[in-house]
Interface confidence: low
């Protein structure tokens, strides 16, 4: 079983998963879909990487520049590294400042 | 109903610069949901993605072309714009504007094409 | 760069007949692959997207199937109109970097 057919017999299942099970689906070539991402436990998108984000997305990733104002998007890239963001060329705007040193991300999310 | 429309310079000297613009009406080209791209295709031959932008001004190119290329996105004339410099014969193509939905890399709507040559 | 083989290159078929054209990708494109229709002096025009999905206003005579690297296009009734040259284009790469099949071209019997 290829990764987009495992990823549609998993994809009801999704909305409550995993940071760990977020993390290895990225290793699948899966490319799941906005609307599934959408629909995603904000704590277990949180801890995801620009990369782990990117290859979990796949093509579809152009999508966040859509969506960067709603949750949980929103508040994925206010944890990311701005240098990190840019990297995908789409223009998402609001992470991290470049140079910033990261003391607690924690503290982050209760400011925004 | 969605337009298309390429326009530009038929004929570049080789070394020279390739500048095409399209023209989008009766849609926005402001909308979130679409990028807007570039394809050519040489006479006889197939279809080859030059690069696609957002109405953010944020721009993809092919790797190929990546050293040659600037596309551009002028909202308030609902126009964006290709450059490509350095051109030689092999540049001489069919170039269609196209519309790309941001969730996919399909192009769904077309600009009919304008052909531009490279000739000295 | 993902390199997406069409065959064969010409495709002749009667009216009314049957037509399956074949696109291979060098590797797994998952579902990411569009069809599209050129007639002499126009432009493409999308045909199928996601592998398997009409795009509006296109007859339910045309179907495509497949997944990963093997992809097929059926035309189950050949009209007059339907004689054209089809691409593939695959989209599943980032950055973007979108290929096309070469292309078959569909002539008359």
């Known amino acids: 079983m290829n990764g987009s057919e495992y990823f549609v017999k998993i994809q009801s299942f999704l909305g409550g998963a995993p940071t760990e099970d977020l993390k290895a689906l990225s290793q699948q070539n899966v490319s799941m879909d906005l609307a599934t991402f959408m629909k995603l436990r904000t704590d277990a998108v949180l801890p995801l990487t620009v990369a782990e984000v990117q290859k979990l997305l796949g093509p579809h990733v152009e999508g966040l520049k859509a969506e960067e104002r709603h949750r949980p998007v929103r508040d994925w890239i206010l944890r990311q590294r701005q240098d990190d963001l840019d990297t995908l060329g789409l223009g998402l705007q609001g992470g991290i400042p470049n140079g910033y040193l990261v003391l607690d991300l924690s503290m982050q999310e209760a400011l925004s | 109903q969605l337009q298309l429309q390429e326009s530009g310079p038929g004929l570049v000297k080789p070394s020279e610069t390739l500048s095409l613009t399209c023209t989008v009406s009766?849609?926005?080209?402001?909308?979130?949901?679409?990028?807007w791209g570039w394809i050519r295709q040489p006479p006889g031959k197939g279809l080859e993605w030059i690069g696609s932008?957002?109405?953010?001004?944020?721009?993809f190119y092919s790797p190929s072309l990546k050293s040659r290329l600037n596309i551009s996105v002028d909202t308030s004339k609902k126009q964006f714009s290709l450059k490509l410099s350095s051109v030689t014969a092999a540049d001489t193509a069919v170039y269609y504007c196209?519309?790309?939905?941001?969730?996919?890399?399909?192009?769904?709507?077309w600009g009919q094409g304008t052909l531009v040559t490279v000739s000295s | 760069e993902i390199v997406m083989t069409q065959s064969p290159a010409t495709l002749s078929v009667s009216p009314g007949e049957r037509a399956t054209l074949s696109c291979r990708a060098s590797?797994?494109?998952?579902?990411?692959l569009a069809w599209y229709l050129q007639k002499p002096g126009q432009a493409p025009r999308l045909l199928i997207y996601?592998?398997?999905t009409r795009a509006t206003g296109i007859p339910a005579r045309f179907s495509g199937s497949g997944s990963g690297t093997e992809f097929t296009l059926t035309i189950s009734s050949l009209q007059s109109e339907d004689f054209a040259v089809y691409y593939c284009?695959?989209?599943?790469?980032?950055?973007?970097?979108?290929?096309f099949g070469q292309g078959t071209k569909l002539e008359i019997k």
């Open positions: 932008v957002y109405y953010s001004g944020s721009a």
């Open positions: 590797q797994s494109v998952s579902s990411n």
């Open positions: 996601g592998t398997s």
């Open positions: 284009q695959q989209y599943n790469t980032w950055p973007p970097e979108y290929t």
């Open positions: 009766g849609g926005s080209i402001s909308s979130s949901s679409y990028y």
């Open positions: 196209a519309r790309r939905p941001y969730k996919s890399g399909l192009f769904d709507f």
